[in-house]
């Protein structure tokens, strides 16, 4: 029997740590190769609120498996250690909790949205990426445990959240709620009404969660969120009913009440008398068979557009419906129109509508070169949105700090890295994308004439980051382009 | 470390069982004493949501099944099986299943077991069929106390320590599996190319050798669904598990006279949780890998897994760069037409 | 329960100018266009146009452009219609309906303008 | 702009007549047509939306039909209360225009 708060407790977590310490460090070569690798492992099992138990006593039966290795015995006798120790310093926290043996919840697994890509990691004894991972999950998972039982005496007034609200256009979902933390951290959970509750957003100090990949899968659901709040560095303290604080959200119906996006003309062409408008259709994050499905596919006939129609000289406005994505109206030969679209879905009570597409005029260029460059970062925003539910661990060559007499060599780069993206995804709306944003941005860059830049690092040169960096550093410089236009 | 660290640790974290196996905690349910509505049972779920690590590594499950004239309570604990728990010597305690057996207590019908494997004390068996047999039998019924006053009988002794500690083929600890074990269900899983299981027990199956198994059964009245942990070495419904090397479930139709019989195998954890009927599966062996990729010039590249849809990545030799706007990923897909699997070709280009 | 009430009827000289209300209650204002139809006596409904109370947009039969101006108060779920210049055949019930895109489904009780010298 | 012809201009028929208006549109709306009901000094009511949807609360004797450029409105079983005028209106594109009505009188 081991006192955690005493002498036990110092010993278990310093050797735990230092044995931790120890086998990262003879790892530290391990890395290079393991790029964001997402192992079956760590989707099913989380240190999650209340199952910290169940995570560290799973993780220490899988750091056994690594003991035949046919490595150093220093190695060997550290990872038993680490894995031994784990184990019974479990059951002392079990007992400074004031619990039985550590409670571990339902052996439930969580599950995964991405398919098992038969990655049998438990089988693979040079898997040396897994264990690394493994090591940094049970130190932080540890930390997080030990941080909380050194501050159980202090105080533990939390602060309910309140003003939940649920923040959905195109159905990428967000609660958020308010206050901002001091001294305490949140965990959001969601459920349908018949459904289990999930946890989302861990501990954070946000006041804002992406909710997302849990309403997608069922967008005709009725969803229910609650926001819990523990005390900073204490989470396994509870409010005086000894359960931790929380806060119920209104309902939510993705399909009825997430908001219409902004509609976007994707092109119009005039034959005569008649001008065919079509409107693009948006991508959401709504999934099926492994593709992204557009507004269209989700909503079907309840999705109607309204354009407005004028002509360039004049204000009087006109306006036609469709329960497709094209328009075909009559014009005056001659003259040039412009427009501007509204998404409505009619069976609606709140919500109906959109706000107004931008306008579109003929006779000139679709929205000149700016507009063109407005286009390419909600082109580059929609394909973070779409990688998201992805796991593509490309790191791509990005330059962070354009100087703005390489902006155009540096835009070439992200062009070109661009495409690794459309090859790894595999996936038909970010090709699409992809396409149709080098194309606005290729229009842009000629527009400039062929501009020699000398001095400027090859893109093979730049650092190579994550796509999540990629992006941002694209967004600047396409900003940058769009203040010097 | 600190010398007198270093031997606490050395000296008190690890336990050994007789053949110097390094022993490790066991999981039990852990709710104490609860009411309960078990009666006239062949066996009873405990219905106790509480997984717990217990203490000591020595320490076994137990379960403690009580009626008198006002209730029945079921109380569920960890306990080291050297002490005597409610004044009875745990006689039982290496079995695998919790089989109860009843002991003499004034004023009430008391029955008790206890039992090693993970959450064993989640399943109370009062059955007389398994009160009689062999506790090493096959078949997994396992389990049976033999008396001998609380030490194990030597050969008891020697399979619980071979069965404890299994290795696969390269020597790697083997640890029990997590399946689905809902047994059989009723389900509305039809015409679809696969079907969640939608059972909520996750267990840990009692021997590391055992893989996930899903059984799909239609007849004219209704359609039902078997999930549970079994011996591959072992048939199931008469049939071999041919699949159970495989990481999905991928069902396949037998032949069953009077019903419509599908049944898969697995060895991931939860595998039987996802059942796949879909064609594309059936006709290809779930064990496909592929062979070593092509060389990529100036390009090396380290496989950790050569299963189908693993992605992989060559990596630029030094002194080398991966040109920009290509990638460096293969991915292990199936060529349909032959049933063969392949790497793809990369669109790599490494330059100095 | 949703309800439009119009206000009463105006008698008008020519020349004038008449601005009729439309009050929309239970239901979101700016979730539905407002519509305004005429009905000259005896005769059929005649569409003047629409305002959309989300973005302010108005859209006009041509033979009511300059005749009539639609507006909205969004504080107080109102919508208006002022006609100018009024002239004897102007004399009609002018009613507003709420629009769901594919119909009028709620209408107003109708407001009778009558221009007479 | 769409011309909507509606025919016949007045139609006389008894209670538990089956009667058919029809709505031509001068170009393709699709099915974006809706039929209305007026009692004399009433507001208009809405019977028929999406030319074959029947609107909330309206007694299924009533019943829309056709797409493109002809539409019909038909009662299968007239009722005392069924006498008024009934209008069409294409809602496609402003402006969004009725038909100049059919008046159903009791024979």
């Known amino acids: 029997d081991c006192d955690i708060e005493g002498k036990d407790g110092k010993q278990y977590e310093s050797v735990l740590m230092v044995s931790i310490d120890q086998l990262l460090d003879s790892m530290k070569e391990i890395g290079s190769n393991c790029l964001n690798n997402e192992f079956n492992f760590f989707k099913r099992h989380i240190c999650d609120a209340n199952k910290e138990g169940m995570f560290l006593f799973r993780a220490a039966r899988k750091l056994r498996q690594f003991l035949k290795m046919n490595s150093t015995g220093d190695f060997d006798l550290h990872l038993l250690k680490v894995s031994e120790g784990t184990t019974i310093l479990l059951n002392c926290t079990g007992q400074v909790k004031g619990r039985k043996p550590a409670a571990l919840g339902e052996a439930q697994p969580t599950k995964s949205l991405e398919e098992n890509k038969s990655l049998k990691e438990q089988k693979k004894l040079n898997d040396l990426c897994f264990l690394k991972r493994l090591l940094q999950e049970i130190k932080t998972c540890w930390n997080k445990i030990l941080m909380g039982t050194k501050e159980h005496s202090g105080t533990t007034n939390t602060v309910a959240a309140y003003n939940l609200t649920w923040k959905s256009t195109n159905f990428k979902t967000i609660l958020e709620w308010e206050p901002k933390p001091v001294n305490q951290v949140y965990t959001v959970q969601i459920s349908t009404k018949s459904g289990d509750w999930k946890s989302k957003c861990f501990y954070t100090t946000d006041t804002e969660c992406d909710l997302t990949d849990e309403i997608v899968k069922d967008v005709k659901q009725t969803y229910l969120a609650r926001v819990f709040s523990y005390p900073a560095g204490n989470v396994e303290s509870t409010g005086s009913a000894g359960e931790p604080l929380y806060e119920n959200s209104p309902e939510f119906t993705p399909y009825l009440e997430t908001n219409l996006g902004q509609p976007t003309i994707q092109s119009f062409e005039q034959v005569g008398t008649k001008v065919n408008v079509t409107v693009e259709d948006e991508r959401t994050l709504v999934r099926r068979n492994n593709t992204f499905l557009s507004l269209r596919d989700v909503f079907g006939k309840d999705l109607i557009y309204t354009l407005y129609y004028w002509k360039s000289s004049s204000s009087g406005k006109k306006t036609a419906k469709t329960n497709t994505n094209e328009f075909l109206i009559d014009v005056d030969k001659g003259e040039n129109y412009c427009f501007s679209v509204q998404a409505v879905i009619p069976s609606r009570t709140v919500n109906r509508k959109s706000t107004d597409s931008p306008v579109e005029c003929m006779g000139q260029e679709k929205g000149e070169f700016r507009e063109n460059w407005v286009n390419v970062i909600s082109d580059l925003k929609k394909i973070e949105d779409l990688i998201q539910s992805m796991h593509i661990d490309a790191t791509l060559y990005t330059e962070s700090d354009v100087h703005p007499s390489c902006k155009v060599t540096a835009m070439k780069c992200f062009l070109l890295e661009l495409q690794v993206i459309s090859l790894e995804s595999g996936d038909a709306s970010i090709h699409d994308t992809v396409e149709n944003l080098i194309i606005l941005a290729n229009n842009s860059l000629s527009s400039n004439g062929n501009v020699t830049e000398s001095g400027c690092k090859e893109c093979e040169e730049l650092e190579e980051k994550n796509i999540k960096e990629f992006l941002q550093s694209f967004v600047h410089i396409v900003q940058m382009f769009i203040n010097t236009s | 470390i600190p010398p007198h660290v270093q031997k606490s640790v050395n000296n008190d974290m690890i336990v050994t069982d007789n053949n110097g196996a390094v022993k490790f905690p066991q999981l039990c349910k852990f709710c104490d004493v609860r009411f309960s509505t078990c009666d006239n049972q062949k066996s009873c779920m405990s219905n106790c949501s509480i997984t717990s690590i217990c203490e000591k590594p020595q320490e076994v499950c137990v379960a403690v099944w009580r009626k008198n004239d006002e209730n029945i309570t079921l109380e569920t604990v960890c306990h080291d099986p050297k002490l005597p728990y409610h004044d009875f010597i745990l006689e039982d305690a290496a079995s695998p299943k919790c089989i109860m057996k009843e002991k003499k207590k004034p004023g009430e019908t008391f029955f008790m077991c206890s039992c090693s494997s993970d959450e064993c004390n989640d399943n109370i068996i009062f059955s007389e069929e398994y009160n009689t047999s062999n506790p090493d039998g096959g078949g997994g019924s396992g389990g049976g106390g033999s008396g001998g006053g609380g030490s194990i009988p030597p050969h008891v002794q020697k399979s619980v320590n071979n069965d404890m500690i299994v290795t696969d083929n390269n020597g790697a600890v083997k640890f029990p599996q997590l399946c689905k074990f809902c047994d059989v269900r009723f389900s509305t899983c039809d015409n679809q190319k696969s079907c969640m299981s939608n059972c909520s027990i996750t267990s840990i199956c009692e021997k590391p050798q055992e893989v996930c198994v899903a059984v799909w059964r239609k007849n004219d009245e209704n359609i039902t669904l078997e999930t549970v942990c079994h011996d591959p070495k072992l048939p199931y419904h008469d049939f071999i598990l041919e699949d159970a090397a495989s990481p999905k479930c991928i069902m396949k139709e037998k032949k069953k006279p009077g019903e419509t019989f599908f049944m898969c195998s697995c060895s991931s954890d939860e595998c039987n949780d996802n059942i796949i009927f879909s064609e594309e599966y059936n006709t290809s062996n779930p064990d496909i890998t592929c062979p070593p990729p092509m060389s990529v010039e100036h390009a090396d590249i380290w496989v950790k897994s050569y299963s189908l849809y693993s992605r992989e990545r060559y990596i630029c030799n030094s002194g080398f760069k991966r040109k920009a706007g290509t990638s460096s990923l293969t991915e292990c897909v199936l060529n349909k037409a032959t049933n063969v699997a392949h790497w793809t070709t990369p669109s790599l280009k490494c330059i100095r | 329960q949703i309800q439009l009430v119009q206000s009463g009827g105006e008698v008008k000289k020519p020349g004038a100018s008449v601005r009729v209300s439309c009050k929309a209650s239970?239901?979101?204002?700016?979730?539905?266009?407002v519509y305004w139809v005429r009905q000259s006596p005896g005769k059929g409904l005649e569409w003047i146009g629409y305002?959309?109370?989300?973005?302010?947009?108005?859209i006009y039969d041509q033979n009511f452009k300059g005749k009539a101006t639609l507006t909205v108060d969004k504080s107080t779920s109102t919508a208006y219609m002022e006609l100018s210049s009024l002239r004897s055949e102007d004399t009609a019930v002018y009613f507003c309906?709420?629009?769901?895109?594919?119909?009028?489904?709620?209408w107003g009780q109708g407001t009778t303008v009558t221009v007479s010298s | 702009d769409i011309q909507m012809t509606q025919s016949p201009a007045s139609l006389s028929a008894s209670v538990g007549d089956r009667v058919t208006i029809t709505c031509l549109a001068s170009?393709?709306?699709?099915?974006?047509l809706a039929w209305y009901l007026q009692k004399p000094g009433k507001s208009p009511q809405l019977l028929i939306y999406?030319?074959?949807n029947l609107a909330d609360g309206v007694p299924s004797r009533f019943s829309g039909s056709g797409s493109g450029t002809d539409f019909s409105f038909t009662i299968s079983s007239l009722q005392p209360e069924d006498f008024a005028t009934y209008y069409c209106?294409?809602?496609?594109?402003?402006?969004?225009?009725f038909g100049q009505g059919t008046k159903l009188e009791i024979k």
């Open positions: 999406a030319a074959t």
């Open positions: 170009q393709t709306i699709d099915t974006w």
């Open positions: 239970g239901y979101s204002f700016t979730d539905y266009n």
């Open positions: 309906a709420r629009d769901v895109t594919t119909a009028l489904d709620f």
């Open positions: 209106q294409q809602v496609y594109s402003s402006p969004f225009t």
């Open positions: 305002i959309d109370p989300y973005n302010g947009i108005t």
